[in-house]
């Protein structure tokens, strides 16, 4: 018979014959022959192959490097890779999340507009007139200046975007 030029799904062409691919979780040890089936072996511990394949080596599971702010979200199997995610307080540097960085803090004079998530960084905004922030924080919003009037006090020192107003007693008119 004429040797095949194409093979069925889950097969591959080698030495003019169609051999079965190895199933996910297994690697190729030897190609099939006229007399023998394809020989496959399961991937070892911490290895995987996620497709029907003719690979002679399994892939290593991804390492979720804590130095890059990563932790294991889902442990890998012989058929799936490990899935990493960011540690608490860190966010991904891209959609693929190959590494993470610590959330940025908002400097004094800026407040948190939006708290960071695992995929997005802190969003800061400048404190408008009447508000201040005197700390570097990933959580604190701009605080309103203290209202001296409601405390029966007067402003002794004006506030800025980084400092609160300083209140003091009203000057008593002397008789």
């Amino acid at each position: 018979p004429e040797p095949p030029t194409a093979c069925r799904e889950k097969q591959y062409l080698i030495n003019s014959q169609c051999c079965s691919l190895c199933q996910p979780g297994q690697k190729l040890v030897s190609d099939c022959t006229e007399f023998t089936e394809t020989e496959c072996l399961p991937c070892g511990e911490s290895e995987f192959l996620d497709t029907w394949n003719r690979e002679t080596h399994c892939h290593q599971h991804k390492y979720c490097d804590p130095n890059l702010g990563l932790r294991v979200q889902q442990k890998g199997t012989s058929e799936t890779d490990t899935i990493c995610t960011c540690e608490e307080g860190w966010h991904c540097t891209s959609e693929a999340c190959e590494s993470c960085v610590l959330h940025r803090s908002c400097s004094p004079g800026f407040g948190v507009k939006q708290i960071a998530t695992g995929v997005s960084d802190t969003i800061c905004e400048p404190c408008p007139v009447g508000f201040f922030s005197n700390v570097s924080s990933a959580f604190e919003k701009c605080h309103p200046w203290t209202s001296c009037e409601t405390k029966d006090l007067v402003v002794q020192q004006a506030g800025t975007n980084k400092t609160d107003v300083v209140c003091g007693p009203q000057d008593r008119l002397r008789a």
């Epitope: 996620d50 290593q60 130095n67 890779d81 540097t93 959609e95 693929a96 590494s99 960085v101 940025r104």
Partner: antibody
Framework: VKESEGGLFKPKDTLTLTCTVS????????VSWVRQAPGNGLEWIGG???????YYASWAKSRATITRDTNLKTVTLEMTSLTAADTATYFC??????????WGPGTLVTVSS | AFELTQTPASVEAAMGGTVTIKCQAS??????LAWYQQKPGQPPKLLIV???NLASGVSSRFKGSGSGTEFTLSISDLECADGATYYC??????????FGGGTEVVVK
Amino acid sequence: VKESEGGLFKPKDTLTLTCTVSGFSLSSYGVSWVRQAPGNGLEWIGGIGSDGSAYYASWAKSRATITRDTNLKTVTLEMTSLTAADTATYFCARGGITVYAMWGPGTLVTVSS
Amino acid sequence: AFELTQTPASVEAAMGGTVTIKCQASQSISNGLAWYQQKPGQPPKLLIVGASNLASGVSSRFKGSGSGTEFTLSISDLECADGATYYCQSYFSSSSTVFGGGTEVVVK
């Protein structure tokens, strides 16, 4: 990771380099391209993430295209409108927007008329 | 555009001494900074990730510090083999992935 052979190109030519990976899946790790002109520093060109998203340095956006073939385990860099300033050693490295712990040996690309 | 400025461009130090290299980002990159060592004819070697964490197999003589916009790499007890060019790299986001200009370290 290993880059294909570079070589001599003429100004205005298009450069195509291929990075072939082994031991890891392109569905698990991204690949980036970095170049280094003779006697100069490292310059990030761009990369492709494990999710297939491509990213480029601002200077390379209009000239570079990075693609991948997960079955062939290759990542390709195509750069158009070459000039003498593109003469450099081109490296591919494992990783998208991340750090690069695994690098190819590099391949020299010379642009000259 | 985002920039990483590395200083000095070159530094000479005696064997057994210490060198300090600075890297300044034009905007905050949190701790998204790495350091590399490169020797002539070789690809770069990763030394530090996350601004201060040693990469696998790297000597503890290398020390990274800083966050935000100011970063430092210190190499103590200098050895002949430390003679190389050192680069910082930001990986905070795709728009701020860039290498510093490099610092050549010459060990006398």
